[in-house]
Interface confidence: low
């Protein structure tokens, strides 16, 4: 297996965020509420929407786009250049598939290090790990082709936007209310 090496070409340079929590990857937590929140994406230097589960998570979570921008985005020029890897695959390509601890049923793709191919799996909707792609193409571009564009160097640069899809086993017995 090729070892993952640090990136050598980042333009513009990554600046140190005003607050350290701005560099945290988005974390919707293990709970299953449906709360619209915003996080700062260190890869794009933009505030983006995500669905928060209602508990755990981290401080990179804001009630409004404005608050997110005020805390994290104001010191960054808009970043248009993608991060590139010198060689090898991002280290998260070697993580096992992980559906997380929630109970949605979302089709996602992961890189199977045994078969050396991207394969489909069912994702629960929260947590899990970064070996989790919305499309087969994105998975192939990131993990099958020896790198290319994508994130996941260290935790500080890892950020993913999680799409929440409600659902669960047929016997699931709760009355759902999208509160907050």
């Amino acid at each position: 297996d090729e070892e993952f090496t640090n990136i050598t070409d980042i333009k513009p340079p990554l600046q140190k965020p005003t607050h350290s929590f701005c560099a945290m990857k988005v974390d919707d937590g293990p709970c299953r509420a449906y709360i619209k929140r915003f996080f700062f994406n260190i890869l794009t230097h933009q505030c983006e929407e995500f669905i928060y589960g209602g508990c755990e998570g981290n401080e990179n979570r804001f009630e409004s786009l404005e608050e997110c921008k005020e805390k994290c985005a104001r010191d960054y020029p808009k970043m248009t250049t993608k991060l590139t890897f010198q060689k090898g695959k991002p280290d998260f390509c070697f993580l096992e598939e992980d559906p997380g601890i929630c109970r949605g049923y979302i089709t996602r793709y992961f890189y199977n290090n045994q078969s050396k191919q991207c394969e489909r799996f069912k994702y629960g909707g929260c947590l899990g790990n970064l070996n989790n792609f919305e499309s087969l193409e994105e998975c192939k571009n990131t993990c099958e082709n020896g790198g290319g564009s994508g994130g996941g160097l260290n935790d500080i640069f890892e950020a993913q936007k999680i799409e929440w899809h409600e659902g669960g086993p047929p016997h699931h017995h709760h009355h759902h209310h999208h509160h907050h």
Epitope: G53, E56, P99, I101, H174, H179
Partner: antibody, heavy 118, light 113 residues
Framework: EVQLVESGGGLVQPGGSLRLSCAAS????????MSWVRQAPGKGLEWVSA????????YYADSVKGRFTISRDNSKNTLYLQMNSLRAEDTAVYYC???????????WGQGTLVTVSS | QSVLTQPPSLSGAPGQRVTISCTGS?????????VQWYQQLPGTAPKLLIF???NRPSGVPDRFSGSRSGTSASLAITGLQAEDEANYYC????????????FGGGTKLTVLG
């Protein structure tokens, strides 16, 4: 019908070990995170540990970190709690429960009593 | 000492309305974390009563309702019945305790008469 049945409790000396099991039925076990919650005699509830549906993510209360290990065997629909270096304050009824909406535990087992005493 | 504070005991007559309070802090309820409520009848396992602040699982009577505001939450029981005599626990998440699910100390509800 959802059923969770704990076993493995008993009397153990301080410093000893015990392994609890929780047999699950009536739901797709691998689709659910599971937790252990304990209750000392005459006291309140205390969360101990949780594990993701796949077993890939584990969480522990500070009071048991480094001593207890949660695991699961999805092929056997069974949850485990390996308890090492047991202390008198670990004496409690241990419940397994499945994680559901909003961090709630929506189904609970009947509990198994662990007594740590010399 | 529990992270969430509940009154140790409460009592009410059949048919009355009782409210059990649960007081937290800025690191749990005040940080927008949901609260759950459990009922534990004598000698039995806890049962989920309210999840996500104010949602009832199916099978829980609508006599039970929950709310949360700021650093406090409450469980209201209307039309109190003898079978409601039990211990009630609130539960949430506390971000200051390295990712710990936390409970209140429990409230023993006695139905009089």
């Amino acid at each position: 019908e959802v059923q969770l049945v704990e076993s493995g409790g008993g009397l153990v000396q301080p410093g000893g070990s015990l392994r609890l099991s929780c047999a699950a039925s009536g739901f797709t076990f691998s689709s659910y995170a599971m937790s252990w919650v304990r209750q000392a005699p005459g006291k309140g509830l205390e969360w101990v540990s949780a594990i993701s549906g796949s077993g890939g993510s584990t969480y522990y209360a500070d009071s048991v970190k480094g001593r207890f290990t949660i695991s699961r065997d999805n092929s056997k629909n069974t949850l485990y709690l390996q308890m090492n270096s047991l202390r008198a304050e670990d004496t409690a009824v241990y419940y397994c429960a499945n994680n559901g909406a909003a961090a709630a535990w929506d189904y609970w087992g009947q509990g198994t009593l662990v007594t740590v005493s010399s | 000492q529990s992270v969430l504070t509940q009154p140790p005991s409460l009592s009410g007559a059949p048919g009355q309305r009782v409210t059990i309070s649960c007081t937290g802090s800025s690191s749990n309820l005040g940080a927008d974390y949901d609260v759950q409520w459990y009922q534990q009848l004598p000698g039995t396992a806890p049962k989920l009563l309210i999840f996500g602040n104010n949602n009832r699982p199916s099978g829980v009577p609508d006599r039970f309702s929950g709310s949360r505001s700021g650093t406090s939450a409450s469980l209201a029981i209307t039309g109190l019945q003898a079978e409601d005599e039990a211990n009630y626990y609130c539960q949430s998440y506390d971000r200051s305790l390295s990712g710990s699910m936390v409970f209140g100390g429990g409230t023993k509800l006695t139905v009089l008469g």
